[in-house]
């Protein structure tokens, strides 16, 4: 049985997908089916993350790398790694603890995930609405009055609902 | 779905060489260290040789070592046993498998005999 | 190296009947053991890791046991389709090693 020593630390010659045990004359082992090491010189080999329930497997786990989940259809991720799913609501809506619910008057929401945010205040940079917002959707601000050539009429900002002045992120 | 097809196998001459490959699908063949084992006509199963994931670390049973070659080619997604200085005893089928051990192809023989 | 010495070297059982393999190391090999299934023609199939594992779609009538150096294959009720070799082997070091084989018949 041939094999390569380090003068240094025996384990470092262990690569990936194997293990190492300083208490052996033999030190390297390969990692157990669903197990994995992502990089050499390991004295354990990690349990292979299972995607189940709700998680589903976007990748999987090899002998040198962890498997990883994304969520079902009508989930989404939240966290490092996907370490939570989320359900989904529609545009226009945000989840709270009831399930999901319609945003109020003056927010909105464009994505299937998040909170329902305030519509930009077109006033407080001295512009006009030029295309008023919806649940689904923030206004479109437009020139300032001063801009518009005379005789144009401006639109009158709807009043929000929440504080204003935050701008979508 | 993991499959590991073997093949290079055949009648070869005693101190002859025979090279055998083994295409890896439906798994990250890169991510794999990868097994060759080897079976003589009914007999149990031998370890021959193990590469580990990235090619750098090469193990060899006693018996085959100074005469055969593991390598592999992961942008081909396949293993490889070069084999030299070929003996009668050589004679197995042979067969691939990741280093979890846990899917193994479907072997190709090889017969050294003159 | 380390020696897997499986036994018996053959069986003949009844369908039904409950089987019991052993497996023994010549060394500690802590529960670095597997237990893997070979049909006349065909390439083995991995049915127990880690001694006792069962393997993703092996059925429940497998059972692994043991530890350090004695280890067991237990077929609860022997079924047509398992008349095939058994071998053990052990990963819990280079060179890996297998075991012989029993060689499981049918009445």
């Known amino acids: 049985f041939e094999r390569t020593r380090s003068l240094q630390d025996p384990c470092s010659n262990c690569p990936a997908g194997t293990f190492c045990d300083n208490n052996r004359n033999q030190i390297c082992s390969p990692c157990p089916p669903n197990s994995f090491s992502s990089a050499g010189g390991q004295r354990t080999c990690d349990i292979c993350r299972q995607c189940k329930g709700v998680f589903r497997t976007r990748k999987e786990c090899s002998s040198t790398s962890n498997a990883e989940c994304d969520c079902t259809p009508g989930f989404h991720c939240l966290g490092a790694g996907c370490s939570m799913c989320e359900q989904d609501c529609k545009q226009g809506q945000e989840l709270t603890k009831k399930g999901c619910k319609d945003c109020c008057f003056g927010t909105f929401n464009d994505q299937k995930r998040g909170i329902c945010r305030p519509w930009t205040n077109c006033s407080l940079d001295g512009k006009s609405v030029l295309v008023n917002g919806t649940k689904e959707r923030d206004v479109v601000c437009g020139p300032s009055p001063a801009d518009l050539s005379p005789g144009a009429s401006s639109v009158t900002p709807p009043a929000p609902a929440r504080e204003p002045g935050h701008s979508p992120q | 779905e993991v499959q590991l097809v073997e093949s290079g196998g055949g009648l070869v001459k005693p101190g002859g060489s025979r090279k055998l490959s083994c295409a890896a699908s439906g798994f990250t063949f890169s991510e794999f260290g990868m097994h060759w084992v080897r079976q003589a006509p009914d007999k149990g199963l031998k370890w021959v040789a193990y590469i580990s994931s990235g090619g750098s670390t090469i193990y060899y049973a006693d018996t085959v070592k100074g005469r055969f070659t593991i390598s592999r080619d992961n942008a081909k997604n396949t293993l490889f046993l070069q084999m030299t200085s070929l003996r009668s005893e050589d004679t197995a089928m042979y067969y691939c498998?990741?280093?979890?051990?846990?899917?193994w192809g479907q072997g190709t023989t090889l017969t050294v005999s003159s | 190296n380390i020696v897997m010495t499986q036994s018996p070297k053959s069986m003949s059982m009844s369908v039904g009947e409950r089987v019991t393999l052993s497996c023994k190391a010549s060394e500690n090999v802590g529960s670095y053991v597997s237990w893997y299934q070979q049909k006349p023609e065909k390439s083995p199939k991995l049915l127990i890791y880690g001694a006792s594992n069962r393997y993703t779609g092996v059925p429940d009538r497998f059972t692994g046991s043991g530890s350090a150096t004695d280890f067991t294959l237990t077929i609860s009720s022997v079924q047509a389709e398992d008349l095939a070799d058994y071998h053990c082997g052990q990963s819990y070091s280079y060179p890996l090693t297998f075991g012989a084989g029993t060689k499981l018949e049918l009445k």
């Open positions: 498998a990741r280093d979890w051990v846990d899917y």
